[in-house]
Amino acid sequence: DLKVEMMAGGTQITPLNDNVTIFCNIFYSQPLNITSMGITWFWKSLTFDKEVKVFEFFGDHQEAFRPGAIVSPWRLKSGDASLRLPGIQLEEAGEYRCEVVVTPLKAQGTVQLEVVASPASRLLLDQVGMKENEDKYMCESSGFYPEAINITWEKQTQKFPHPIEISEDVITGPTIKNMDGTFNVTSCLKLNSSQEDPGTVYQCVVRHASLHTPLRSNFTLTAARHSLSETEKTDNFS
């Protein structure tokens, strides 16, 4: 009996530009002889319903139809027909099919590959055209994919050390698509510093599918109006 097993859940998520390994494990009742078996990987894009060959391995020959695509002969011996794709791009997301032939048997499995890009975040202070004691703080998130993103603002005071979400005077602009397919967005917070306590910490909080934990950038309001300082930012998708 010949069986193929793909990633549990049927979906794999990978960061943009990563060297991704798309899993495909072979289960066979006898030891595998790689010289008498075949592996073919196919890809179907999200936009076109046409399947194309990515890689094939037959006995003493292998061929990559996508530059750098490879199945390890050394891993194949122990039943691992996973496909390595170096430098994965956004447009390579879609359905991947692993087809295994151990004559006369054939088995196959499919998996959805999602490619994500983590946002970079930075805080800017814009005082141009602002009234006295009024400041506009901008939180720029750039280079993310997919488009869906959530940006919120929080503040912590010495009286209330737990973060409180700010809903007033927040404007989040439209997402802008970059040439490489990633997106940018800016969220603005308008503050009247005369009405705020010195020592108040403000945070821009970015939540995105590519991030395990939100990306936080903060600044502290000082007696001298403001002190803009970006704390450690975590871009930790893995």
């Epitope: 060297n19 899993f23 390890s72 050394w74 039943g79 390595r84």
Partner: antibody
Framework: EVQLVQSGAEVKKPGASVKVSCKAS????????MDWVRQAPGQGLEWMGD????????LYNQKFRGRVTMTVDTSISTAYMELSRLRSDDTAVYYC?????????????WGQGTTVTVSS | DIVLTQSPDSLAVSLGERATINCKAS??????????MNWYQQKPGQPPKLLIY???TLHSGIPDRFSGSGSGTDFTLTISSLQAEDVAVYYC?????????FGQGTKLEIK
């Protein structure tokens, strides 16, 4: 920085088993296989087998089949090699080595070695 | 199993001179246009260190005085200008077939 840190020296009696560990750091553990190679005193190198951390699949040198068991714990990036029914000629330094498997096959980083002495 | 035979067993070369070690395989270690032959250096009390893989590719961080050549069954490791720190035992290894096998080693000394 890639590092493979092996467990300490062992002294065993004939017939016993030994389990050597190899803790990996500085790279994605599942992207490479782990080879196990041994070297008897004053002798050359002998490949014992390898394990694929991606699926736990193993390939053993026929010489050791039935006596060797290779396992991994991916949650702590650690590989293990257990050799049973030890004999005096199993006295050797046992090495784990990270093995590239996609673009050729070679052991590019090695552990410091674990000395196993089998003596009654 | 593929048997690898290194020659010579030991070699003494003067500092600055060329050192050549040969490795002969009992059958071809070529597959799909590549040669699966690797070379390692081992100094006393240390683990082996990768020098060359795929017959001729220099591993990162290895000085370019080391080079590898050959295909099929005959391979050569060359040190163009011997340095004192090159004193070691050198092993060839094939990775085309299991079990992966090593040569018996060549001990390189300074004359």
């Amino acid at each position: 920085e890639v590092q493979l840190v092996q467990s300490g020296a062992e002294v065993k009696k004939p017939g016993a088993s030994v389990k050597v560990s190899c803790k990996a750091s500085g790279y994605t553990f599942t992207d490479y296989n782990m080879d196990w190679v041994r070297q008897a005193p004053g002798q050359g190198l002998e490949w014992m087998g390898d394990i694929n951390p991606n699926n736990g699949g193993t390939l053993y040198n026929q010489k050791f089949r039935g006596r060797v068991t290779m396992t991994v714990d991916t949650s702590i990036s650690t590989a293990y090699m257990e050799l049973s029914r030890l004999r005096s000629d199993d006295t050797a330094v046992y090495y784990c080595a990270r093995s590239e498997v996609f673009y050729g096959n070679y052991a590019d980083y090695w552990g410091q070695g674990t000395t196993v002495t089998v003596s009654s | 199993d593929i048997v690898l035979t290194q020659s010579p067993d030991s070699l003494a070369v003067s500092l600055g001179e060329r050192a050549t070690i040969n490795c002969k395989a009992s059958q071809s270690v070529d597959y799909d246009g590549d040669s699966y032959m690797n070379w390692y250096q081992q100094k006393p009390g240390q683990p082996p260190k990768l020098l060359i893989y795929a017959a001729s590719t220099l591993h990162s961080g290895i000085p370019d005085r080391f080079s590898g050549s050959g295909s099929g069954t005959d391979f050569t490791l060359t040190i163009s200008s011997l340095q004192a720190e090159d004193v070691a035992v050198y092993y060839c290894q094939q990775s085309k077939e299991d079990p992966r096998t090593f040569g018996q080693g060549t001990k390189l000394e300074i004359k």
